[in-house]
């Protein structure tokens, strides 16, 4: 056969679906690789062909679209399973071609089993809710296109294994789950089970997401430098090791880049000749506020180093702050005999 533009195995799109549930999988060519959509391709006389390689096999084979009850079907650029089976796991390829053009991409599909509490190897999306922020909602994800708008599905929400039946704080409202107040105790996995009829059969879609309650923007502050501060003086003799921690607290801010850096005499440590090392550690609170510590270390400090300006800088979306460390050279204690002699007025 003639040459085909092969985009290879698109492992970025590791698709996971639950066993015994419907799955609709769009050909990734039109989503990520080609500059035109399926309708344009179809109008131009291009045909979309599907095939697959079973798990732990090398042989590409056509997909059987003649299974009972049309269990696997294709509709436009979507491959449908109604429902999936465990042995549907494998690498699927969609190929767009005519006599003069060919382009294809493969992607892995994993059919996953779940237990009665919805635990599974499925990678879960994380939805962040602001703590104590008023009404917030999560929405049952990835259910578009499974049933027409004329069909009214029933939706049941669970937290972990427990069906959410009351509406005291977390209110199930169809595809949405509303939180009157988000609390640390609301952290966990939430599952929506969408049940809908189709051609005399009943299908279930199970979608689980992780809720993480994070710091609220109304409580967010600019970075706070806890160290260095005015109360600690780094007093060293030449030849000793100088260690100065820069400890900064950052409020959680969605999509904020938190930065901490040192300057020595106004320059970045990389831009000066001193033998300086910087080690960073990061810790998080339960609401994802962040504490970053950068320890500036000079193994054998010189008297010149002790005259320099050491400034810790921090920046987030809320602002930028800086604080200089108080560094000074230790005054050597006078020798005992000299001090004694002077004390007795010796000349």
């Amino acid at each position: 056969s003639e040459r085909c533009d092969d985009w290879g195995l698109d492992t970025m799109r590791q698709i996971q679906v639950f066993e015994d549930e419907p799955a609709r999988i769009k050909c990734p060519l039109f989503e990520h690789f080609l500059k035109f959509n399926y309708s344009t391709a179809h109008s131009a006389g291009l045909t979309l062909i599907w095939y697959w390689t079973r798990q732990d096999r090398d042989l590409e084979e056509p997909i059987n679209f003649r299974l009972p009850e049309n269990r696997i079907s294709k509709e436009k650029d979507v491959l449908w399973f109604r429902p999936t089976l465990l042995n549907d796991t494998g690498n699927y390829t969609c190929m767009l071609r005519n006599t003069t053009y060919c382009s294809k991409v493969a992607f892995p599909l994993e059919v996953v089993q779940k237990d009665s509490c919805f635990n599974s190897p499925m990678k879960l999306p994380v939805h962040k809710l602001y703590i104590e922020y008023g009404i917030q909602r999560i929405t049952c994800p990835n259910v578009d296109g499974y049933f027409p708008s004329s069909v009214k599905p029933t939706i049941t929400w669970y937290m972990g294994c427990y069906k959410i039946q009351n509406f005291n704080n977390v209110i199930p409202e169809g595809m949405n789950l509303s939180f009157l107040i988000a609390l640390i105790s609301n952290n966990g996995n939430y599952t929506c089970v969408v049940t809908y009829p189709e051609n005399g059969r009943t299908f279930h879609l199970t979608r689980t997401l992780t809720v993480k309650v994070v710091g609220s923007p109304k409580n967010a502050v600019p970075p706070v430098i806890h160290s260095p501060n005015d109360h600690v003086v780094y007093e060293k003799e030449p030849g000793e090791e100088l260690l100065i921690p820069c400890t900064v607290y950052f409020s959680f801010l969605m999509d904020s880049r938190n930065e901490v850096w040192w300057t020595i005499d106004g320059k970045k440590p990389d831009d000066i000749t001193i033998d300086v090392t910087i080690n960073e550690s990061i810790s998080h609170s339960r609401t994802e506020d962040e504490t970053r510590t950068q320890i500036l270390s000079i193994k054998k400090v010189t008297s010149e180093d002790l005259k320099r300006s050491y400034v810790c800088h921090a920046r987030s979306a809320k602002g930028e702050v800086a604080k200089a460390a108080k560094v000074k050279q230790k005054v050597p204690a006078p020798r005992y005999t000299v001090e004694l002699a002077c004390g007795f007025g010796a000349t």
Partner: antibody, heavy 126, light 111 residues
């Protein structure tokens, strides 16, 4: 477990039109500590139940009110004392009612209003 | 705004009989509905929440059904102690508010 209501004073909650009154509700015997919403509901003589609003009893400051309240009523709470209060201002004869507090635990273990106070009668009259 | 409409009122039935009370929401409240029983001089008592879940300690002759906008409370094997007024409570939210709205109440008379 109980919700004990107080307020209205020795006169049994008789207030002049335009006046103010504070009603309070003390929670005791809860294993749930302060993880619940305290709701306030009123009932005019011979009439049905009407929701006023709710306040979260824990450390987070969160309140919701019925739209008709229009800022005349204010909910507050004292976390340490496990007390929730309803401040009634600019009272009119139409506010004459029994005022109830009710609990809704902020988890999935029970229903809204599984526990109620005994009610306090507020009479607005000149 | 959410409106809860209860019918009929009053309703009467003989001991051992069955009573059905309906509650209609002006908008979809899914299963966010509770039923309360109130006797004269007493605070309301929770019977059912989540449209159909029986509250702790409530006899099984009380049952709730429905979702969306139409809900029903059924009392079967009616007892004289069931004479009371019954209220439904619907709950929904919007962007920044929560609405807790009671129905007008249905008086049950036991003959």
């Amino acid at each position: 477990q109980q919700l004990e209501q107080s307020g209205g004073g020795a006169e049994g909650g008789l207030v002049k039109p335009g006046g103010s009154l504070e009603l309070c509700c003390k929670a005791s015997g809860f294993s749930q500590s302060n993880n619940y919403w305290m709701h306030w509901v009123r009932q005019a003589p011979g009439k049905g139940l009407e929701w006023i609003g709710c306040i979260y009893a824990g450390s987070s400051d969160s309140t919701y009110y019925a739209s008709w309240v229009n800022g005349r009523f204010t909910l507050s709470r004292d976390i340490d004392q496990s007390i929730g209060c309803l401040q009634l201002n600019s009272l009119t004869a139409a506010d004459t009612a029994i005022y109830y507090c009710a609990r809704a635990i902020a988890d999935f273990s029970s229903g809204w209003g599984d526990l109620w106070g005994q009610g306090t009668l507020v009479t607005v009259s000149s | 705004a959410l409106v809860m409409t209860q019918t009929p009122s009053p309703v009467s039935a003989a001991v051992g009989g069955t009573v059905t009370i309906n509650c209609q929401a002006s908008e979809d409240i899914y299963s966010n509905l509770a039923w309360f029983q109130q006797k004269p001089g007493q605070p309301p008592k929770l019977l059912i929440y989540g449209a159909s879940t029986l509250a702790s300690g409530v006899p099984s002759r009380f049952s709730g059904s429905g979702s969306g906008t139409e809900f029903t409370l059924t009392i079967s094997g009616l007892q004289s102690d069931d004479a009371a007024t019954y209220y439904c409570l619907g709950v929904c939210t919007d962007i920044s508010a929560v609405y807790n709205v009671f129905g007008g109440g249905t008086e049950v008379v036991v003959k």
